[in-house]
């Protein structure tokens, strides 16, 4: 008789999850000389230890501390790019502007990007069938707690001018419930961060509105100002041209508004 297994509402662990994490770790350390001291087997053991044999609705930040310690990484604190609901463009940007970093350009972010994982209470099995959904099941699931933990640490490390890319095509350009809105905004350190600069990315070619005047952006400005951090906002009307001009800043067409 098969053992009863909890059915969650979300997709199960990504197939070949252990191999993916380990291979990504090896690849990351291969590409980044400053991380070549990292022992990828130990990283995987710590990652696994955070969720294996634990109830997938009862994961804490404490569970991830051994992994956080092994993945400690110094990125230039004044070169941090946060993003909300516009990951692909943010990553395209840091691939071109190599001195800037999103969370997914760090080891821990790179390991977990686009992956799902969870275990089962009291068994050493990984659950490939289903994992808890943040809304329908529980918020303290392995994936959500991981991103909350690394996002908090990433925001805490930021200094000087911090940039955030926001999706101007969404009804809530700034969403208080996003990781940026619920975690990163509240963990920027006012004694280190002088300014948060928002880049609002326009979706439509003919969209010439000033989305920096959007009510949700005003809400973000209010939250940031109350935290004694200055706020500025720029419209990126043409994201394709924006990326092209990051690649080739000397291009004559790059002097006009993007």
């Amino acid at each position: 008789v098969p053992r009863w297994r909890q059915q969650w509402s979300g997709p199960g662990t990504t197939k070949r999850f252990p191999e993916t994490v380990l291979a990504r770790c090896v690849k990351y350390t291969e590409i980044h000389p400053e991380m070549r001291h990292v022992d990828c087997q130990s990283v995987w053991d710590a990652f696994k230890g955070a969720f294996i044999s634990k109830h997938p609705c009862n994961i804490t930040e404490e569970d991830y501390q051994p992994l956080m310690k092994l993945g400690t990484q110094t990125v230039p604190c004044n070169k941090i790019l946060l993003w909300s609901r516009i990951k692909d463009l943010a990553h395209q940007f840091t691939q071109v502007q190599r001195d800037m970093f999103t969370l997914e350009d760090t080891l821990l972010g790179y390991l977990a990007d686009d992956l799902t994982w969870c275990g089962e209470f009291n068994t050493s099995k990984i659950n490939y069938q289903s994992c808890p959904d943040w809304r329908k099941d529980c918020s303290n699931n392995p994936v959500s707690v991981f991103w909350k933990t690394v996002s908090r640490r990433f925001a805490e490390a930021a200094c000087d001018v911090v940039h955030v890319m926001l999706n101007g095509s969404r009804s809530k350009i700034f969403d208080k419930n996003s990781t940026f809105g619920s975690v990163e905004v509240h963990n920027l350190q006012p004694e280190k961060v002088q300014t948060l600069e928002a880049w609002v990315i326009h979706g439509g070619r003919e969209d010439s509105r000033d989305l920096c005047q959007d009510p949700t952006i005003k809400e973000l400005e209010s939250i940031i100002s109350k935290r004694n951090i200055q706020f500025s906002c720029k419209n990126i009307y043409r994201p394709d041209k924006f990326l092209q001009c990051v690649k080739n800043p000397e291009d004559s067409s790059c002097t006009s508004e993007i």
């Epitope: 380990l22 350390t29 291969e30 070549r36």
Partner: antibody, heavy 116, light 107 residues
């Protein structure tokens, strides 16, 4: 305990190709890099390139670019190194090793002799 | 590419004595340096990585130090099985490069 076992010695003619295999056992193969290092008789060690089988994208030293092909077969836990347009100076022992930049487990080596 | 230069080419030491081997990089390699031991007819064996971390199973008499461009491998008290050729290797910049080796022989 991970072990790497390489194919046997080869004698080749100049201009031909050689393909050396490296079979891994006793450990997970896919996510560790396998690198290839050669050593000419009485000489030092020379890194040729490597591959992480899981990703399948090899890295080559510039010197060997265009002449070397490194591949891996996850199903058999075997990595391969093929060197083409052989010349006499390619006579060497060819080693596979685990790791992409520091090499903690080595194969026993495969002697490739290039001679007319 | 980074050139690794080892000295001396040959080191004659009596068993029980201390041996000090040097390795110099043509530009900084941070701490991304490994040492290997190779005996005749055998594959190399990893001794030290990260300039100073001993690999699994390597006796405590082997120690590594240095960073940047100057590195040292020290064998505190040579045993008969330590007579071999020693190579340093940088893994900071592609392509990874090895020194030409130092042969440690019995005096």
């Amino acid at each position: 305990q991970v072990q790497l076992v390489q194919s046997g010695a080869e004698v080749k003619k100049p201009g031909s190709s050689v393909k050396v295999s490296c079979k891994a056992s006793g450990g997970l193969f896919s996510f560790y890099a396998i690198s290839w290092v050669r050593q000419a008789p009485g000489q030092g060690l020379e890194w040729m390139g490597g591959i992480i089988p899981f990703f399948g994208e090899p890295q080559y030293a510039q010197k060997f670019q265009g002449r070397v092909t490194i591949t891996a077969d996850e199903s058999t836990s075997t990595a391969y190194m093929e060197l083409s347009s052989l010349r006499s100076e390619d006579t060497a022992v060819y080693y596979c090793a685990r790791g992409s930049y520091r090499f903690d487990v080595w194969g026993q080596g495969t002697l490739v002799t290039v001679s007319a | 590419e980074i050139v690794m230069t080892q000295s001396p080419a040959t080191l004659s030491v009596s068993p029980g004595e201390r041996a000090t081997l040097s390795c110099r990089a043509s530009q900084s390699v941070s701490s991304n340096l490994a040492w290997y031991q190779q005996k005749p007819g055998q594959a190399p064996r990893l001794l030290i990585y990260g300039a100073s971390t001993r690999a699994t199973g390597i006796p405590a008499r082997f120690s590594g130090s240095g960073s940047g461009t100057e590195f040292t491998l020290t064998i505190s008290s040579l045993q008969s099985e330590d007579f071999a050729v020693y190579y340093c290797q940088q893994y900071n910049n592609w392509p990874w490069t090895f020194g030409q080796g130092t042969k440690v022989e019995i005096k």
